[in-house]
């Protein structure tokens, strides 16, 4: 008789999840020699231990502590790029600007990027059928708690000028409910961080509006200022040109506004 299985509203664990995490870990240590002390088998065991046999709505940050410890990594604290709802461009940017880092450029972010995972209470099985949805089921699910944990740690590590890329095409350019708005903003350390600089990325070719004047950006400025951190904002009118100019800063067309 097939065992009754909890049906969640979200997609199930990504196929080949264990193999993918292990392979990503090995790849990461191959291309980042400074992380070759990491034992990828131990990393996978710690990752698995955070959610296997646990109710997928009762996951805590504490569950991920063994993994956090194994994945401890020092990135230059003044070279951090946060992003909200514009991941691809942020990653294209750090791919060119090699001395800057998004969360997904760190080992733990790289391991979990775009993956879904969950287990079941009291069984060692991974649930490939469905996993809890943050809105429809519960917020303390394995994926959400993981990203909350690593995002908090990443923001806490930041110093000097922290950059954030925001999507100017969205109705809420700054969204208080995003990971950036709900976790990272509140975990920047005022004693270490001098300025948060927002880059608002324009979507339309002919969009010449100053999106730094958007009400949600003013809301972000207010939150940041109350935390004794300075705020600045830049419009990136042409993201394609922006990337091109990061690649070739000496190009004559790169002195004008982008």
């Amino acid at each position: 008789v097939p065992r009754w299985r909890q049906q969640w509203s979200g997609p199930g664990t990504t196929k080949r999840f264990p193999e993918t995490v292990l392979a990503r870990c090995v790849k990461y240590t191959e291309i980042h020699p400074e992380m070759r002390h990491v034992d990828c088998q131990s990393v996978w065991d710690a990752f698995k231990g955070a959610f296997i046999s646990k109710h997928p709505c009762n996951i805590t940050e504490e569950d991920y502590q063994p993994l956090m410890k194994l994945g401890t990594q020092t990135v230059p604290c003044n070279k951090i790029l946060l992003w909200s709802r514009i991941k691809d461009l942020a990653h294209q940017f750090t791919q060119v600007q090699r001395d800057m880092f998004t969360l997904e450029d760190t080992l733990l972010g790289y391991l979990a990027d775009d993956l879904t995972w969950c287990g079941e209470f009291n069984t060692s099985k991974i649930n490939y059928q469905s996993c809890p949805d943050w809105r429809k089921d519960c917020s303390n699910n394995p994926v959400s708690v993981f990203w909350k944990t690593v995002s908090r740690r990443f923001a806490e590590a930041a110093c000097d000028v922290v950059h954030v890329m925001l999507n100017g095409s969205r109705s809420k350019i700054f969204d208080k409910n995003s990971t950036f708005g709900s976790v990272e903003v509140h975990n920047l350390q005022p004693e270490k961080v001098q300025t948060l600089e927002a880059w608002v990325i324009h979507g339309g070719r002919e969009d010449s509006r100053d999106l730094c004047q958007d009400p949600t950006i003013k809301e972000l400025e207010s939150i940041i200022s109350k935390r004794n951190i300075q705020f600045s904002c830049k419009n990136i009118y042409r993201p394609d040109k922006f990337l091109q100019c990061v690649k070739n800063p000496e190009d004559s067309s790169c002195t004008s506004e982008i």
């Epitope: 193999e19 993918t20 392979a23 090995v26 790849k27 240590t29 020699p33 070759r36 002390h37």
Partner: antibody, heavy 123, light 112 residues
Framework: EVQLVQSGAEVKKPGATVKISCKVS????????MHWVQQAPGKGLEWMGW????????DYAEKFQGRVTITADTSTDTAYMELSSLRSEDTAVYYC????????????????WGQGTLVTVSS | DIVMTQSPLSLPVTPGEPASISCQSS???????????LNWYLQKPGQSPQLLIY???TRAAGVPDRFSGSGSGTDFTLKISRVEAEDVGVYYC?????????FGQGTKLEIK
Amino acid sequence: EVQLVQSGAEVKKPGATVKISCKVSGYTFTDYIMHWVQQAPGKGLEWMGWIDPEYGSTDYAEKFQGRVTITADTSTDTAYMELSSLRSEDTAVYYCARVAIITTVASGGFAYWGQGTLVTVSS
Amino acid sequence: DIVMTQSPLSLPVTPGEPASISCQSSESLLHSNGKTYLNWYLQKPGQSPQLLIYWMSTRAAGVPDRFSGSGSGTDFTLKISRVEAEDVGVYYCQQFLEYPPTFGQGTKLEIK
């Protein structure tokens, strides 16, 4: 069985661009970094760059920066290496290569190589 | 970049006799994980290189036990206990401690 099969020899004129392919089989393409290595005639081996086929991220040797582009097509399990503004010194055999994994650790040595693609640059 | 220097550049050997190739790196290749990121390859005439040794002294799969690697942080040796005719080709050392990975100039082993 792991196999890396490269495209055939090419003859190009100076200033042209060449694009070499490396089709893999016997393993999950996205699970491994792919490297490219140049060997000029009578010369040694020179690393050119890598690609992570899963993410498309790359890194290139300074010597080739700006002229080399490594890409990957996960739908066909194929990596590509494109070299532009060709000059006579680019006449060489080009290899794709991959490490082995020994009990969940990258060996750090290229255990699998393509058969090589000879590119001749001549006017 | 780490510079790899091999010697000799040419090595004529009688079959059945031992052979030894040296390789020096401009920096230590010992990682904090305890592994030394030094590899040895053999490129037989008309073929792609093949991995012989990784982590300074670990033989790659299928490599005969007459091949052995040893060394310290910057000085390395590849030894062939009894050279066979099939061992002819160019031997390269390579560091993979950091990027870019760099190779030695190669040592051509030929049969006397």
